[in-house]
């Protein structure tokens, strides 16, 4: 057979679907690899061909589109399972071709099982809600295209094993789940089960997402430097180790990049010749506020080092702040026999 542009196995599209549920999978060629859509390709006389390799097998085989009740079918650039079975797991390939052109891509499909509380190996999307921020909603994801708009599905929402009913601050509203005022106790996994009829059969779509309640923008402040501060003086003798922590609190801000850095005499540590090391640690509160600590360390400090300016800087989407550490050379204690005696005028 003639050459075919092979885009290989697209592991970025690790598709996971639940066992015994409908699944519609679009050929990734038109979404990520080619500059034209299916309609254009079809009009130009190109044909879309599907085949697959079963899990733990090397043999590519055609997909059987003649199963009872059309369990697997193709519609335009979509491969349909009505419903999936566990042994549908494998690598699927869609190939677009005619006599002069060929392009193909493979992608992994994993059919996963869920338990009665919707626990499964499925990777869950995370939806962040602001704490005590007023009404916020989440929407049952990835259910478009499964049934026509004329069909009115029933939607049931769950938190873990439990149907969401009579909750204090969470109200199911069809495809949406409304949080009247999000609290830490609302953290967790939420599942919508969409039930719809098709050709005399009933199908279920299960979608689970993780809700994480985070700090509200109403409460967000610029970075706060807790250390260094005016109360602590780093007093060292030459030859001792100098350790200065820079501890900064950052309010949670969606998509904000939090940065902490030291300057020594106005320069980044990398740009100066001192043997300095910087270690960073990060911790998070329950609402994803962040505390970053960068410890500046000079193993054997010199008297020159003790005269330098050490400034901690922090930046977030809310602003930039800086604070200098108070560093000084320790004055040696007087030696009584010599210095003190001299002080008393001894000869």
């Amino acid at each position: 057979s003639e050459r075919c542009d092979d885009w290989g196995l697209d592991t970025m599209r690790q598709i996971q679907v639940f066992e015994d549920e409908p699944a519609r999978i679009k050929c990734p060629l038109f979404e990520h690899f080619l500059k034209f859509n299916y309609s254009t390709a079809h009009s130009a006389g190109l044909t879309l061909i599907w085949y697959w390799t079963r899990q733990d097998r090397d043999l590519e085989e055609p997909i059987n589109f003649r199963l009872p009740e059309n369990r697997i079918s193709k519609e335009k650039d979509v491969l349909w399972f009505r419903p999936t079975l566990l042994n549908d797991t494998g690598n699927y390939t869609c190939m677009l071709r005619n006599t002069t052109y060929c392009s193909k891509v493979a992608f992994p499909l994993e059919v996963v099982q869920k338990d009665s509380c919707f626990n499964s190996p499925m990777k869950l999307p995370v939806h962040k809600l602001y704490i005590e921020y007023g009404i916020q909603r989440i929407t049952c994801p990835n259910v478009d295209g499964y049934f026509p708009s004329s069909v009115k599905p029933t939607i049931t929402w769950y938190m873990g094993c439990y149907k969401i009913q009579n909750f204090n601050n969470v109200i199911p509203e069809g495809m949406n789940l409304s949080f009247l005022i999000a609290l830490i106790s609302n953290n967790g996994n939420y599942t919508c089960v969409v039930t719809y009829p098709e050709n005399g059969r009933t199908f279920h779509l299960t979608r689970t997402l993780t809700v994480k309640v985070v700090g509200s923008p109403k409460n967000a402040v610029p970075p706060v430097i807790h250390s260094p501060n005016d109360h602590v003086v780093y007093e060292k003798e030459p030859g001792e180790e100098l350790l200065i922590p820079c501890t900064v609190y950052f309010s949670f801000l969606m998509d904000s990049r939090n940065e902490v850095w030291w300057t020594i005499d106005g320069k980044k540590p990398d740009d100066i010749t001192i043997d300095v090391t910087i270690n960073e640690s990060i911790s998070h509160s329950r609402t994803e506020d962040e505390t970053r600590t960068q410890i500046l360390s000079i193993k054997k400090v010199t008297s020159e080092d003790l005269k330098r300016s050490y400034v901690c800087h922090a930046r977030s989407a809310k602003g930039e702040v800086a604070k200098a550490a108070k560093v000084k050379q320790k004055v040696p204690a007087p030696r009584y026999t010599v210095e003190l005696a001299c002080g008393f005028g001894a000869t």
């Epitope: 509380c117 938190m159 094993c161 439990y162 149907k163 009913q165 009579n166 909750f167 969470v170 967790g188």
Partner: antibody, heavy 122, light 107 residues
Amino acid sequence: QVQLVQSGAEVKKPGSSVKVSCKASGSPAEPYAIQWVRQAPGQGLEWMGYIIPSLGGYDYAQKFQGRVTITADESTSTAYMELSSLRSEDTAVYYCARGQTLYDAGRQFDIWGQGTLVTVSS
Amino acid sequence: EIVMTQSPATLSVSPGERATLSCRASQSVSSNLAWYQQKPGQAPRLLIYGASTRATGIPARFSGSGSGTEFTLTISSLQSEDFAVYYCQQYNNWPWTFGQGTKVEIK
């Protein structure tokens, strides 16, 4: 160590109500459900309903709808089960039980209270 | 609602012998089944969940098997403290339902 401690035995007249309490110690940080189950003398176990104290969610078995009310006071980590319009066949030991999370169905009855005997007699 | 049927109602076994208890669901409950032990005057105790997983602190002589509609609890060598009533419970569908129990008594 999580424990559930229930209120003491009650003797009630037919037509009256009873309210049984269940106090949890050592509660986990994340939401959990308290289940109520009853057992008539010499009989099996019968699920009555549940409440999720931190979220307020509850549900009752069809058989008890309209007669049972399950509530919770988060500040004292105490759940309550009130059964009204009592009849002699409500004579039973009433148990509360709970799990550690809302996500592990098999362990929703992991920890049990000691039981409360409610006797309905005229 | 799913009806759970246990058999036999009473099982007479000698200490050291094997006991096999059955539980049947009126429709498939997958592996969403638990077993409980109850001694006179005590609350039930979780033994097995997920049809075959032993709960914390439960001795290895207790084992569970089955899926769908047919389940078994096996006590490999009965000890004196194992004489009690055993209940199965399904948690596949609401309302969660219990079987009527099997009493294991000394022969």
